[in-house]
């Protein structure tokens, strides 16, 4: 792919007007960014600051515990997925500031915007893995006692990452840079051109595998776990249960606009007014989905037992308490005791 290192005159003000007489002056429009783009920039800035710092802390705290604590493995992988996605934000931010001009070349166009989709698939597959782990702890405690170990957890994470990469490939392959003639601008986006069916297929697969199917399975999974929890009156685990629900719910809430607009755009003509309106909201939807990359550390902190008291402690210390303490609370993606607890204690807890 050519690298576009040319100077671009400032034609941001230009908006093509239909004129039969080509001698008539063209009306100029504002060179300012649209409101959705401004909102996207604000969200990106906040997500980048919170996401990089928060996830870096989570990685730092969990990395030392990952050898002996299974929950630390889950948290570590989720944090790595979020942290990786956050690294693309300065580039995406710069592009929006430049009215979506993409001066970073073809390779960056293929890789960087695909990171959020990699994050989506990695996160949901890891959440599914964690949920399966929670389910087994509740319903198959003896099996867990015999087979549930760090090695198996790492294998599960590797499978999740592998599948996530595999599912990201279509979007990666169809990303191209397009150099528009006027106003001079290089755009980074997906181009299916003749293959509208393939575009729809990719959007449907993304919606089903990255949203609807996980929503259905996780809802069923946590409904069963909730019923078991409530039937045994496990009051000690309700706070952590709220954390699990918060993490899973946040995933679906923040991905919803992106998924809805994505599926709609795949079924609309690119020149239709609805498509063009949705296209203007695209950056905002992406930024909204990006909130997922910074929300987990926030949930972990809020989930800390005796939260008010811990505010006096340093943030790494607080996160360590939340993520690695040997209690119900530290499992912020689950609501059972950690692996070092006995199975008897686990079954009592639920």
């Amino acid at each position: 792919m050519d690298s576009f290192n040319y100077t671009t005159p400032d034609y941001g003000h230009y908006d093509d007007k239909d004129t039969l007489d080509l001698n008539t002056p063209v009306d100029k429009t504002s060179n300012t960014l649209r409101v959705p783009d401004i909102l996207a920039l604000v969200i990106f800035a906040v997500v980048f600051l919170v996401g990089v710092l928060g996830n870096a802390l989570v990685v730092w705290v969990t990395a030392f515990e990952a050898k002996r604590t299974i929950n630390a493995i889950w948290f570590l992988n989720l944090a790595v997925a979020d942290f990786l996605s956050c690294l693309a934000l300065p580039i995406l931010f710069t592009s929006i500031v430049q009215h979506h001009h993409w001066p970073f070349g073809g390779a960056a166009c293929s890789i960087l915007p695909s990171l959020i989709l990699l994050n989506m698939y990695a996160s949901i597959l890891l959440l599914a893995t964690i949920s399966a782990d929670r389910f087994l702890l509740v319903f198959k405690p003896i099996w867990c006692q015999n087979f549930r170990g760090a090695g198996l957890a790492w294998i599960a994470c590797a499978v999740a990452w592998g599948l996530a990469l595999l599912l990201t490939i279509p979007s990666f392959l169809y990303r191209v840079v397009r150099e528009e003639y006027f106003p001079p601008k290089v755009l980074c986006g997906v181009d299916y051109s003749h293959d509208k069916r393939r575009e729809r297929a990719v959007a449907i697969v993304r919606l089903v595998l990255g949203f609807l199917w996980p929503l259905l399975t996780l809802t069923i999974c946590y409904t069963f776990i909730l019923l078991r929890t409530w039937s045994r009156r496990a009051t000690r685990s309700t706070k952590t249960l709220k954390v699990v629900v918060a993490v899973v719910a946040s995933f679906f809430i923040f991905w919803l606009p992106y998924q809805v607009t994505g599926i709609m755009m795949s079924f609309l003509e690119p020149s239709s007014p609805t498509f063009l309106l949705l296209k203007k909201l695209d950056s905002l939807c992406v930024s909204f989905a990006y909130i997922n990359c910074c929300i987990n550390p926030i949930i972990y902190v809020v989930a800390g037992q005796g939260f008010q008291g811990r505010l006096r402690k340093s943030l790494p210390s607080l996160l360590r308490n939340v993520l690695t303490e040997e209690s119900v609370v530290r499992e912020s993606k689950s609501f059972t005791r950690s692996t070092v607890d006995t199975m008897a204690q686990k079954t009592q807890a639920v």
């Epitope: 528009e180 003639y181 020149s271």
Partner: antibody, heavy 123, light 112 residues
């Protein structure tokens, strides 16, 4: 009325250079962009690039970046295209054509064309 | 580069008949501003090209209404409802959405 008058036919040897001219009349030269298009015998049209006479800004088709140089003389309302290191493949009819600029008309359409200049490269 | 594929390359019609020329682009020609910059030019024998239709379906000033353009995205069509003797020549589709600007190979319209 709007007219684009191009220079006469050129017969040159391989490796030489040639400078084609296109004199504009009937409109404000600096308000419109000047594009150059190549047409080989019996073939389609190829866009070489354009020049904004007002600012001197040029944009080339990557294919012609080392082949063509676009310039303009505002005082005489004339656009020029120099073709360097000519080969047999450069034998063609070259058209200058006008599009709206960033302030007048629309830069997307070629509404007026010159009559064309035939360039023949022969040893 | 955007490849513009015209079909047929040659077309022979009787006077008064309808002629239809197809043009397909290798990439979507929808600009980020929502417009589609697909145009049609006619080059009569021994002449320079003349501007016919801009942005898919808009006739340039002075172009008879028997000329009409249609299409969207990557597939476009030029129709001449009642062919007249003065319509013969080579018709080119062209795109100015993306750099470099590109043209189709041309469709030669001949009269029976």
């Amino acid at each position: 009325q709007v007219q684009l008058q191009q220079s006469g036919a050129e017969l040159t040897k391989p490796g030489a250079s040639v400078k084609l001219s296109c004199k504009a009349s009937g409109y404000t030269f600096t308000n419109y962009w000047m594009h150059w298009v190549k047409q080989r015998p019996g073939q389609g049209l190829e866009w070489i690039g354009y020049l904004n006479p007002s600012s001197g800004y040029t944009k080339y088709n990557q294919k012609f970046k080392d082949k063509a140089t676009l310039t303009a003389d505002k005082s005489s309302s004339t656009a020029y295209m120099q073709l360097n290191s000519l080969t047999y493949e450069d034998s063609a009819v070259y058209y200058c054509t006008r599009s709206g600029g960033d302030n007048y008309g629309n830069p997307y359409y070629f509404d007026r064309w010159g009559q064309g200049t035939t360039v023949t490269v022969s040893s | 580069d955007v490849v513009m594929t015209q079909t047929p390359l040659s077309l022979t019609v009787s006077l008064g008949d309808q002629a239809s020329i197809s043009c397909r682009s290798s990439q979507s020609l929808v600009h980020s501003n929502g417009n589609t910059y697909l145009h049609w030019y006619l080059q009569k024998p021994g002449q320079s090209p003349k501007f016919l239709i801009y942005k898919v379906s808009n006739r340039f000033s002075g172009v008879p209404d028997r000329f009409s353009g249609s299409g969207s995205g990557t597939d476009f069509r030029l129709k001449i409802s009642r062919v007249e003797a003065e319509d013969l020549g080579v018709y080119f589709c062209s795109q100015s959405t993306l750099v470099p600007l590109t043209f189709g190979a041309g469709t030669k319209l001949e009269i029976k």
